[in-house]
């Protein structure tokens, strides 16, 4: 049941990326939606050896990752503002989970290149728009009402069955021929119906 609701929630969420609306907009798919979260892809040139990548939401630093090398060429990777991230030889992926409307915003990849020189900062970004489809909204509106109606019908059905059972029991106690009379009535009804058909 829980997993069903979770898949329904995933189905309801849609992510739309509006790129080209800002200077330095990403010329690649920056947002990848999966597993109820979003992977934000921040690319950098293959030649870059050492850098700092910051993920900005509006003007706020959400995540960062710094890659440097020591004098023995040993790599050090640090995060001051930790997010689940993944480093490849030309990109850093930051993962955001449990998406809701508050996540809709401009997201920027702020790349500071240390090596090779000269020191350079580049900013690329796009708009992450989270919306719910009309069908989904209708479903979300009618589903609880439908469930409530079903529960009410079930309760009423139970009450009715209980009431009928109780009535039947009480009538059979007062009239010993009650059951015989009931059977006769049913049989008569059957006969008349058959007559109707032959005519």
């Amino acid at each position: 049941m829980k997993s069903g609701l979770w898949y329904f929630f995933l189905f309801c969420l849609r992510i739309k990326v509006l790129t080209g609306e800002i200077n330095g907009s990403a010329n690649y798919e920056m947002f990848i939606f999966h597993n109820g979260g979003v992977q934000i892809l921040c690319k950098y040139p293959d030649i870059v050896q050492q850098f700092k990548m910051q993920l900005l939401k509006g003007g706020q630093i959400l995540c960062d990752l710094t890659k440097t090398k020591g004098s023995g060429n040993t790599v050090s990777i640090k995060s001051l503002k930790f997010c689940h991230s993944q480093l490849s030889n030309n990109s850093v992926s930051f993962f955001l989970y449990n998406l809701d409307h508050s996540h809709a915003n401009y997201y920027f990849c702020n790349l500071s290149i240390f090596d090779p020189p000269p020191f350079k900062v580049t900013l690329t970004g796009g708009y992450l728009h989270i919306y719910e489809s009309q069908l989904c909204c209708q479903l979300k509106f009618w589903l609880p009402i439908g469930c409530a109606a079903f529960v009410v019908v079930c309760i009423l059905g139970c009450i009715l069955i209980c009431w009928l059972t109780k009535k039947k029991y009480s009538s059979s106690v007062h009239d010993p021929n009650g059951e015989y009379m009931f059977m006769r009535a049913v049989n008569t009804a059957k006969k008349s119906r058959l007559t109707d058909v032959t005519l």
């Epitope: 030649i47 050492q50 440097t68 090398k69 020591g70 004098s71 023995g72 020189p117």
Partner: antibody, heavy 117, light 111 residues
Framework: EVQLVESGGGLVQPGGSLRLSCAAS????????MDWVRQAPGKGLVWVSN????????EYSPFVKGRFTISRDNAKNTLYLQMNSLRAEDTAVYYC??????????WGQGTLVTVSS | DIVMTQSPDSLAVSLGERATINCKSS??????????LTWYQQKPGQPPKLLIF???TRHTGVPDRFSGSGSGTDFTLTISSLQAEDVAVYYC?????????FGPGTKVDIK
């Protein structure tokens, strides 16, 4: 302006210990790997040790491994070199250097360590 | 460990003349598009100073008479027109892996 100032050098007997310090200023100390490089009188440069930005990675020259310990205090902008079991061959000027991503771009004036009985 | 060798041990050049220093590594210093080799200048009584990194890129403020070349295992530092202030010992250094090592140095004097 980047400044590195070493201190703690001096005369010590073989088998003795010494702790060198390097006070850094003029840059964000916690953003850089730092190294110690030494130079025996009239000789060439020899790399001793390095440490990454937060002190989680340290590396040592085979000549000093197990005897020397590099550390840093980013709150105090200071680099340290703890030298134990000193030998005559450790006599040298010890330079504190900043690894500027692709080379030692800043050097202190050095502090002389003399190991002699 | 990678062993760095330099030649010559010393050289004397007339003012305004070209000085050439060679450096050889015991294994290739090329990784990707970078040669992990730097050159330092050490004047008497002073700490070393970074001149060239990645074999051929001049550090900030270094005069353009200094140039670096080479790839793999063979590298060269050239002073196109020697000036009096260039009297120093020049060291090549690799940072290809740990431990980084320096060459023995080449002393440059004025003839």
């Amino acid at each position: 302006e980047v400044q590195l100032v070493e201190s703690g050098g001096g005369l010590v007997q073989p088998g003795g210990s010494l702790r060198l310090s390097c006070a850094a200023s003029g840059f964000t100390f916690s953003d850089y790997w730092m190294d110690w490089v030494r130079q025996a009188p009239g000789k060439g440069l020899v790399w001793v040790s390095n440490i990454d930005e937060d002190g989680s990675i340290t590396e040592y020259s085979p000549f000093v491994k197990g005897r020397f310990t590099i550390s840093r205090d980013n709150a105090k902008n200071t680099l340290y070199l703890q030298m134990n079991s000193l030998r005559a061959e450790d006599t040298a000027v010890y330079y504190c250097t900043r690894w500027g991503r692709f080379g030692f771009d800043s050097w202190g004036q050095g502090t002389l360590v003399t190991v002699s009985s | 460990d990678i062993v760095m060798t330099q030649s010559p041990d010393s050289l004397a050049v007339s003012l305004g003349e070209r000085a050439t220093i060679n450096c050889k590594s015991s294994q290739s210093l090329l990784s990707g598009s970078f040669n992990y080799l730097t050159w330092y200048q050490q004047k008497p009584g002073q700490p070393p100073k970074l001149l060239i990194f990645y074999a051929s890129t001049r550090h900030t403020g270094v005069p353009d008479r200094f140039s670096g070349s080479g790839s793999g295992t063979d590298f060269t530092l050239t002073i196109s027109s020697l000036q009096a202030e260039d009297v120093a010992v020049y060291y090549c250094h690799h940072h290809y892996n740990a431990p980084p090592t320096f060459g023995p140095g080449t002393k440059v004097d004025i003839k």
